[in-house]
């Protein structure tokens, strides 16, 4: 787990989960509601997504020398893309289809923030912006830029995670 | 439209193994996650595990670990679940149905008997 | 695991009766809630998904409301045809547990 004093977190358990991750991700891109959408718009309604940077130390290097700052990257983006998934965007109408995965996408990425962050211990989170769509096609919109941003997300997570829990494992 | 075609009832001796089919048409088979569910005699539901086409990767109820091995065959649109080392307790109704939230699919269901 | 607390296990109404059954989650899941029909012999069929939301072709005399841990479904205007065991399932994050059912029984 990421604690105060740099302990190191249950790589191979992250691994795990951020995979599962990945999947959930792509498998509920599609069923994320009923309008068939040709036209996706511009980009900025999702420019403010959190997305891991070369200066988030998640490279090899960074993370031999100090996890802590790509795990609080990798953090913030975990609740940033939980609270969406739990906001009027997802919530609201249209309905999400009955097949759709989303709950274990937002159950499986407060886990993985749980394991990052033990309770007592809190690192800075980014605000949300106000995304709040009146339209139910503008949600829809959202709901899919969202998916398409978390997945992008969890893949570069997951690529962290398998680094770590090959090299940087106890 | 959407249809899961189930195998057959089984009636198998205890201490083997069991191979159970779910066959999907109507719609992209890859797209869903394909869901079993059990029910005993007379009993409640309980979820055994779920599977991803595309990926193959399978998730298990801790309770069935061991007990069910999930598959899928992509190019016959077909899932299934192995039951192994089979007892009186592994006797019911085994359902596959479509998606990794609520179902609003389901197979008949196939009757597996336990039975020396 | 999540358990699902659902209550009551039997209950006896008659045709045009009004009936609630509840299901109480052992944690927060949201809306992440479906509820199922069951009669003797057939498939579960999809009442009600997220917590409120009506499944395809499902008569509008049924109703789920409910977030967080609580949770009911209600049958307005008993049909005979509605007659059977009721199960609640939540959806937010695996192992999905079921609840133990409601048998609704006529009158």
């Known amino acids: 787990r990421a604690v105060p004093g740099g302990s190191s977190p249950a790589w191979t358990q992250c691994q795990q989960l951020s995979q599962k991750l990945c999947t959930l991700a792509w498998s509920a891109h599609p069923l994320v509601g009923h309008m068939d959408l040709r036209e996706e718009g511009d980009e900025e309604t999702t420019n403010d997504v959190p997305h891991i940077q070369c200066g988030d130390g998640c490279d090899p290097q960074g993370l031999r020398d100090n996890s802590q700052f790509c795990l609080q990257r990798i953090h913030q983006g975990l609740i940033f893309y939980e609270k969406l998934l739990g906001s009027d965007i997802f919530t609201g109408e249209p309905s999400l289809l009955p097949d759709s995965p989303v709950g274990q996408l937002h159950a499986s990425l407060l886990g993985l923030s749980q394991l990052l962050q033990p309770e007592g211990h809190h690192w800075e989170t980014q605000q949300i912006p106000s995304l709040s769509p009146s339209q139910p096609w503008q949600r829809l919109l959202l709901r899919f830029k969202i998916l398409r941003s978390l997945q992008a997300f969890v893949a570069v997570a997951a690529r962290v995670f398998a680094h770590g829990a090959a090299t940087l494992s106890p | 439209h959407v249809q899961l075609q189930q195998s057959g009832p089984e009636v198998v001796r205890p201490g083997a193994s069991v191979k159970l089919s779910c066959k999907a048409s109507g719609y992209i088979f890859s797209a869903y996650w394909m869901t079993w569910v059990k029910q005993r005699p007379g009993q409640g539901l309980e979820w055994i595990g779920q599977i991803f086409p595309v990926r193959g990767s399978a998730d298990y109820n801790e309770i069935f670990e061991g007990k069910a091995t999930l598959t899928v065959d992509t190019s016959s649109s077909t899932a299934y679940i192995q039951l192994s080392s089979l007892t009186s307790e592994d006797s019911a109704v085994y359902y596959c149905?479509?998606?990794?939230?609520?179902?609003?699919?389901w197979g008949q269901g196939t009757l597996v008997t336990v039975s020396a | 695991d999540i358990q699902m607390t659902q209550s009551p296990a039997s209950l006896s109404a008659s045709v045009g009766e009004t009936v609630t059954i509840t299901c109480r989650a052992s944690?927060?899941?949201?809306?992440?809630l479906a509820w199922y029909q069951e009669k003797w012999g057939k498939s579960p069929q999809l009442l009600v998904y997220?917590?409120?939301t009506l499944a395809e072709g499902v008569p509008s005399r049924f109703s789920g409301s409910g977030s967080g841990t609580q949770f009911s479904l209600k049958i307005n205007s008993l049909q005979s045809e509605d007659f059977g065991s009721y199960y609640c399932?939540?959806?937010?994050?695996?192992?999905?547990?079921f609840g133990s059912g409601t048998k609704l029984e006529i009158k």
């Open positions: 399932q939540h959806h937010y994050g695996t192992p999905f547990t």
């Open positions: 997220n917590a409120k």
């Open positions: 944690e927060n899941i949201y809306s992440y």
């Open positions: 149905a479509r998606g990794g939230g609520g179902f609003a699919y």
